[in-house]
Amino acid sequence: YDFTNCDFEKIKAAYLSTISKDLITYMSGTKSTEFNNTVSCSNRPHCLTEIQSLTFNPTAGCASLAKEMFAMKTKAALAIWCPGYSETQINATQAMKKRRKRKVTTNKCLEQVSQLQGLWRRFNRPLLKQQ
């Protein structure tokens, strides 16, 4: 999906009001020094591409994020504020239902959510290179 035509300001508002708080809840008890951000993004569409990938694609050691509250709210925000996004996700959702597993918060998942917080941070404040 090409995130270029999303309403970035509406997504940002949704992030600040709810999604960010759910991410903080998920990370509660984790030291702020624990994880270094290794995934980066260069502009808002790129940030959303990376956010979608980390939130909804199962990775080795962390297969369960898609059912978390922050993920469901992320999905809703993208569906509402990115034209045509929900249509592209129908097949992905059906595949995810088949893969559904018991929710387990592993250290790998905590690291992944820390990366997500970093991607959202850059989505909110893209630091463009000065000309």
Partner: antibody, heavy 119, light 107 residues
Framework: QVQLQQSGAEVKKPGASVKVSCKAS????????IEWVRQAPGQGLEWMGV????????YYSQKFQGRVTMTADKSTSTAYMELSSLRSEDSAVYFC????????????WGQGTTLTVSS | DIQMTQSPSSLSASVGDRVTITCRAS??????LVWYQQKPGKAPQLLVY???NLADGVPSRFSGSGSGTQFSLTISSLQPEDFATYYC?????????FGTGTKLEIK
């Protein structure tokens, strides 16, 4: 807990340079932007620029372009702001500040470094 | 650059009063506005981000509102520790700029 510890007060002559340090602790230094803000005596806050400690990317206010250099040392979790060709109007308190978890504000500030420029 | 204008520049009020400070942006900044409180000789402290979200540990008597170009910070019942200078700042795009400040004094 998160702390930004700045270097001590400086007295400089017009035309000289000053380098202010901001040592971060209590968080992953490279994950968050560091901004620099100054405040002249009895005046408001003035944004100077920002650095991404991970990449070294910077963005400076037009007003300070050519006179300011912001750097970061990842090994010591320290950000630096160097201002050159000093003039009396540069006399101010200089603050470093860390961007918040959400990237939508500054949640922690240094205590400030007072710079006096006088002949 | 986006200009931020605060009003009033100073304000006298009493403990228990309800006060509102306003901030105007020279162009649409959506909800990308922050409010800080600063006391003499101290660094500013974050009160509100995203125009209406209260920062951790900030008393509920503070509230922010607005979007686009017009914003306000309201203190519902002034407490002695609230007498300070308040600044808005846009967080829309680099370069960021601060408002001119509002000094809140005891009447």
């Amino acid at each position: 807990q998160v702390q930004l510890q700045q270097s001590g007060a400086e007295v400089k002559k017009p035309g000289a340079s000053v380098k202010v340090s901001c040592k971060a602790s209590g968080y992953a230094f490279t994950n968050y932007l560091i901004e620099w803000v100054r405040q002249a005596p009895g005046q408001g806050l003035e944004w100077m620029g920002v650095i991404n400690p991970e990449s070294g990317d910077t963005y400076y206010s037009q007003k300070f372009q050519g006179r300011v250099t912001m750097t970061a040392d990842k090994s010591t979790s320290t950000a630096y702001m160097e201002l050159s060709s000093l003039r009396s109007e540069d006399s101010a308190v200089y603050f470093c500040a860390k961007e918040s978890l959400t990237g939508s504000s500054y949640d922690y500030w240094g205590q400030g470094t007072t710079l006096t420029v006088s002949s | 650059d986006i200009q931020m204008t605060q009003s009033p520049s100073s304000l006298s009020a009493s403990v228990g009063d309800r006060v509102t400070i306003t901030c105007r942006a020279s162009e649409n900044i959506y909800s990308n506005l922050v409010w800080y409180q600063q006391k003499p000789g101290k660094a500013p402290q974050l009160l509100v981000y995203g125009a209406r979200n209260l920062a951790d540990g900030v008393p509920s008597r503070f509230s922010g509102s607005g979007s686009g170009t017009q914003f306000s910070l309201t203190i519902s019942s002034l407490q002695p520790e609230d007498f300070a200078t308040y600044y808005c700042q846009h967080f829309y795009e680099t370069p960021l700029t601060f408002g001119t400040g509002t000094k809140l004094e005891i009447k």
